[in-house]
Amino acid sequence: KFSKQSWGLENEALIVRCPRQGKPSYTVDWYYSQTNKSIPTQERNRVFASGQLLKFLPAAVADSGIYTCIVRSPTFNRTGYANVTIYKKQSDCNVPDYLMYSTVSGSEKNSKIYCPTIDLYNWTAPLEWFKNCQALQGSRYRAHKSFLVIDNVMTEDAGDYTCKFIHNENGANYSVTATRSFTVKDEQGFSLFPVIGAPAQNEIKEVEIGKNANLTCSACFGKGTQFLAAVLWQLNGTKITDFGEPRIQQEEGQNQSFSNGLACLDMVLRIADVKEEDLLLQYDCLALNLHGLRRHTVRLSRKNPIDHHS
């Protein structure tokens, strides 16, 4: 309930906000959950706490893990968890699903794409914007404050948009990138009984104990803008938020609108530091709309390490 997922790329700045809120005068203590080691507040450290914020300047893959923040108020302490995953930089252009922020959709009248999480950083204009890894050029694209405006939006404008900016901390500069999908609303549309594209029914997913695992629930609901459509994960028939395991979180993946116009949604289930007991759970991918609900069940199995005998 009081846990938030955050992710970033190695060698980039990552700033994480404590999920619990309080007054500015309250002190906030941060700990690395696995070791219960206090995070320093001195800015000379690469990873340091600054009130409600935890700063990785820059982040390293080894920083991945669950961090605990405690907001100390006069009457009780409020505890929150930040589930941080730092990924290696991809050599190719593709941005994987797990690095995607929530999808935004636009139309001819409203085509703003906000740069995700930018409000946490000390940045100065201009923002750089890329679509499918290509720098955006031309008068149709206007970088304004923390968002991109596209004039005369067309269906071809749908795609993955990356914003890039510089965070400044005490005179040192750190790069930050964030990517989200942009879909273009189709005025004409219809809705169908949900079709789950992934995972397959009764799929067995191989995972490695101690590593992170991602499961994507992907379903299509019809064509064009959908009045009601949702995908979600359940654990043993319980909502993720009610299950109470901070290592297991779901994040909205990208809304997709394929060339055939189908409206699809993704929900990524992120399991940090896979444990034996995770193999015993039943993972249900649920897709629902006004027509009804469809469910595909997944189970996890241990991936056997490859033997390296001579």
Partner: antibody
Framework: QVQLVQSGAEVKKPGASVKVSCKAS????????MNWVRQAPGQRLEWMGW????????TYGDNFKGRVTITRDTSASTAYMELSSLRSEDTAVYYC?????????WGQGTLVTVSS | DIVMTQSPDSLAVSLGERATINCKSS????????????LAWYQQKPGQPPKLLIY???TRESGVPDRFSGSGSGTDFTLTISSLQAEDVAVYYC?????????FGGGTKVEIK
């Protein structure tokens, strides 16, 4: 500059519900909680509850538990307060106020009149 | 709940004179963790929302004239207007900013004598 703009006045019948909105601008909405306070005619200010705008977790005053629901829509930078099973003594001006050391920013207030 | 008791209920002061409002809380508003007193003072004029004057018992909110000052600790607090101006005519409230439910005093009406 920070602004909290509330929805307009409402007239409701006893037993009905009312939902008041509070649109925030001029700051990052999810950085600060949002409180709801009401003021009945000639009465002292009464705190109803607040919401953690980042994770959506509400906390309610005991006097309102079971009747009040505080929610938020981060994409619209808007907080909502819904009060159900209205009675005549719920006639009051309802305010949203941004959390802080003291409430430095308030909405303009929404008058809710409960009358048969 | 913490009960906030204000006195007097109303106060008539000549222009340029000092106005003093007292506020007593049923429990201490001092947080030993940071030595802050979580008490706030507000000014409210008819048809307007309250305006924050003082937080932390004695810290003036930015933009508030320096004739307004707050003092006190624990359970006893005072708001002082050192030299009353015409625009200070209003109702003044103290607030427990320490613990839920946040509670307010009954208000003190300040008028010009």
């Amino acid at each position: 500059q920070v602004q909290l703009v509330q929805s307009g006045a409402e007239v409701k019948k006893p037993g009905a519900s009312v939902k008041v909105s509070c649109k925030a601008s001029g700051y990052t909405f999810i950085n600060y909680g949002m409180n709801w306070v009401r003021q009945a005619p000639g009465q002292r200010l009464e705190w109803m509850g607040w919401i953690n705008t980042y994770i959506g977790e509400p906390t309610y005053g005991d006097n309102f538990k079971g009747r009040v629901t505080i929610t938020r829509d981060t994409s619209a930078s808007t907080a909502y307060m819904e009060l159900s099973s209205l009675r005549s003594e719920d006639t009051a001006v309802y305010y949203c106020a941004r959390e802080g050391d003291g409430f430095a920013y308030w909405g303009q207030g929404t008058l809710v009149t409960v009358s048969s | 709940d913490i009960v906030m008791t204000q006195s007097p209920d109303s106060l008539a002061v000549s222009l340029g004179e000092r106005a003093t409002i007292n506020c007593k809380s049923s429990q201490s508003l001092l947080y030993s963790g940071n030595q802050n007193n979580y008490l706030a003072w507000y000014q409210q004029k008819p048809g307007q929302p309250p305006k924050l004057l003082i937080y932390g018992a004695s810290t003036r909110e930015s933009g508030v004239p320096d004739r307004f000052s707050g003092s006190g600790s624990g359970t006893d607090f005072t708001l002082t207007i050192s030299s009353l101006q015409a625009e200070d005519v209003a109702v003044y409230y103290c607030q427990n900013d320490h613990s839920y439910p946040y509670t307010f005093g009954g208000g003190t009406k300040v008028e010009i004598k």
